[in-house]
């Protein structure tokens, strides 16, 4: 009669994380009496899935009666697969005795789990940066099986092709990570951009996954300063603007100063927003120019986002101003921006 | 008790070649051999390793480059298509009785050079 | 893969002195303890020194002594002899079902 063997007839088997597995054994022969174990590997190391003799395997059914005394069907379902599965999987009758020795292992079947990536993590810069300048922003995936998997990125649509990714473990795992970083470089108008981490994988079935990024949360847009003066008002006051243009974030304090003297600060409460996200202000002095017998130096101080002020300077000369009422002899503007 | 290995010879790249190791002196309820590899100069590479019952496991890099099969009196190694980083001396090792996958006994080793 | 990190790849020191080789393994070892140490000179087959991580093989001096668990291993050779010198090798068993080597460290003495 010919020697038994144990045959597994599918070398591999892929099945989904959350789903079951089933793995194929027949024997050729009831001889040997003796029963068949299942393990997850042929070394020392191996971990018994199940045997037919003893224990308890809450996860492990067979998939035909192997108790009946003519079955020579051996296969079982393993369910709830987990990347932690993977693994190649061994059929092996042992032959009756005290104890039972090893008589013959099938081929092995390789289970390889598919493992959804979870949801891509985008993160950027700590600080924000200013527009000109190229800012890092990492996208983490984890969690996924096989190893093979796409990433792109895009800024409002448009492709980056400034990034780097890397696939870890290298070798074989039960389940691997990504993470990747690219480089964006920033402009004024990029207060509504976002910028988006598209991952594919072969469990997602051609729905990529993505994670974004709004590009408001790391771009500071300074604010230009323009300080203009209004015509001379009644009982000789005039009246002097600081316009506040295109910002962001909105956080700015604004000073002005007399002759170098803090005179008022206030902070930007009502804005308008402008069509790229930036906002405008503008704050107003009042001057009353027979109160100063020389000329005044006025100047509007802005600190935006906790950044150093930048200023920009109206020269009020008072010798121009006549002091009788209704004058309206324009004061020289001789602006400057200071830092 | 002992393992030892033949079979090494020089061989042309793409030439298939087969070691054997031959196991003598025990009588063992269980017990697997092990495949390893050293080039010259270099340290220990482990290939893969098979049970008594015939179940055979493979490093990652090794799996689809060798074969460890078992015969009634050997554990023979397939060498699918040897190329020249595949020179190196060839060890068979045994392990036995303990549960902790230490490679008991070793044979002295065949060397392999694969060169045009 | 599983890595196993061995340093330093070089150590010397004076007869009857102690030699400290580390071995540290990128994940743990099946059961914390599946690490073994091999000693190979030039030309030999490797042999069995420490399995388990620190249970001496037959026939081999206590002076070897293995400690360590999970990912952290060490190998000690005190009261060092000329006969000593060689190279050391640990060896990892894991779950996955693969049994790989550290890089060796070889020891001089002197």
């Known amino acids: 009669e010919e020697e038994l063997q144990v045959i597994q007839p599918d070398k591999s088997v892929s099945v989904a994380a959350g789903e079951s597995a089933i793995l194929h054994c027949t024997v050729t022969s009831l001889i040997p009496v003796g029963p068949i174990q299942w393990f997850r590997g042929a070394g020392p190391a191996r971990e018994l899935i199940y045997n037919q003799k003893e224990g308890h395997f809450p996860r492990v059914t067979t998939v035909s009666e192997s108790t009946k005394r003519e079955n020579m069907d051996f296969s079982i379902s393993i369910s709830n697969i987990t990347p932690a599965d993977a693994g190649t999987y061994y059929c092996v009758k042992f032959r009756k005795g005290s104890p039972d020795t090893e008589f013959k292992s099938g081929a092995g079947t390789e289970l390889s789990v598919r493992a959804k990536p979870s949801a891509p993590v985008v993160s950027g810069p700590a600080a924000r940066a200013t527009p000109q300048h190229t800012v890092s922003f990492t996208c983490e995936s984890h969690g996924f099986s096989p190893r093979d998997i796409t990433l792109k990125w895009f800024k409002n649509g448009n492709e980056l092709s400034d990034f780097q990714t890397n696939v870890d473990p290298v070798g074989e795992s039960v389940s691997y990570s990504i993470h990747s970083t690219a480089k964006v470089v920033l402009t004024r108008e990029d207060v509504h951009s976002q910028v988006i981490c598209e991952v594919a994988h072969v469990t997602l079935q051609g729905d990529p996954l993505r994670g974004t990024a709004n590009l408001s949360e790391t771009i500071r847009v300074p604010p230009t300063l323009e300080v203009t003066q209004q015509p001379v008002r009644a009982e000789n006051q005039v009246n002097v603007t600081c316009q506040v243009r295109k910002f962001y974030p909105q956080r700015l304090q604004l000073t002005w100063l007399e002759n170098g003297n803090v005179s008022r600060t206030e902070t930007a409460s009502t804005v308008t927003e402008n069509k790229d996200g930036t906002y405008n202000w503008m704050s107003w002095l009042l001057v009353n120019v027979s109160a100063h017998r020389d000329d005044v130096k006025l100047t509007c101080q802005v600190e935006h986002d906790g950044q150093p002020a930048v200023s920009k300077s109206h020269d009020l000369k008072v010798s121009a101003h006549p002091k009788e009422q209704g004058s309206n002899t324009a004061a020289e503007n001789t602006g400057s921006n200071e830092r | 008790q002992s393992v030892e290995e033949s079979g090494g010879r020089l061989v042309t790249p793409g030439t298939p070649l087969t070691l054997a190791c031959t196991v003598s002196?025990?009588?063992?309820?269980?017990?697997?051999i092990s495949w390893v590899r050293q080039a010259p100069e270099k340290g220990l590479e482990y290939i893969g390793i098979?049970?008594?019952?015939?179940g055979a496991s493979y490093a990652s890099w090794a799996k689809g480059r060798f074969t460890i099969s078992k015969t009634s009196t050997t554990v023979d190694l397939k060498i699918t298509s040897p190329t020249p980083e595949d020179t190196a001396t060839y060890f068979c090792?045994?392990?036995?009785?303990?549960?902790?996958?230490?490679?008991?006994?070793w044979g002295p080793g065949t060397l392999v050079t694969v060169s045009l | 893969a599983q890595v196993l990190t061995q340093t330093p790849a070089s150590v010397s020191a004076a007869v009857g002195g102690t030699v400290t080789i580390s071995c540290q393994s990128s994940?743990?070892?099946?059961?914390?303890?599946?690490l073994s140490w091999y000693q190979q000179k030039p030309g030999k087959p490797p042999k069995l020194l420490i399995y388990?991580?620190?249970t001496l093989a037959s026939g081999v001096p206590s002076r070897f002594k293995g400690s360590g668990s999970g990912t952290q291993f060490t190998l000690t050779i005190s009261d060092l002899e000329s006969d000593d010198a060689a190279t050391y090798f640990c060896?990892?068993?894991?779950?996955?079902?693969?049994?790989?080597f550290g890089g060796g460290t070889e020891v001089v003495v002197k």
């Open positions: 090792a045994m392990s036995y009785g303990m549960d902790t996958g230490a490679f008991n006994i």
């Open positions: 002196g025990f009588s063992l309820i269980s017990y697997y």
């Open positions: 098979i049970n008594i019952g015939g």
């Open positions: 994940e743990s070892v099946y059961k914390n303890n599946f």
């Open positions: 388990g991580a620190s």
């Open positions: 060896q990892g068993g894991y779950r996955t079902d693969i049994y790989p």
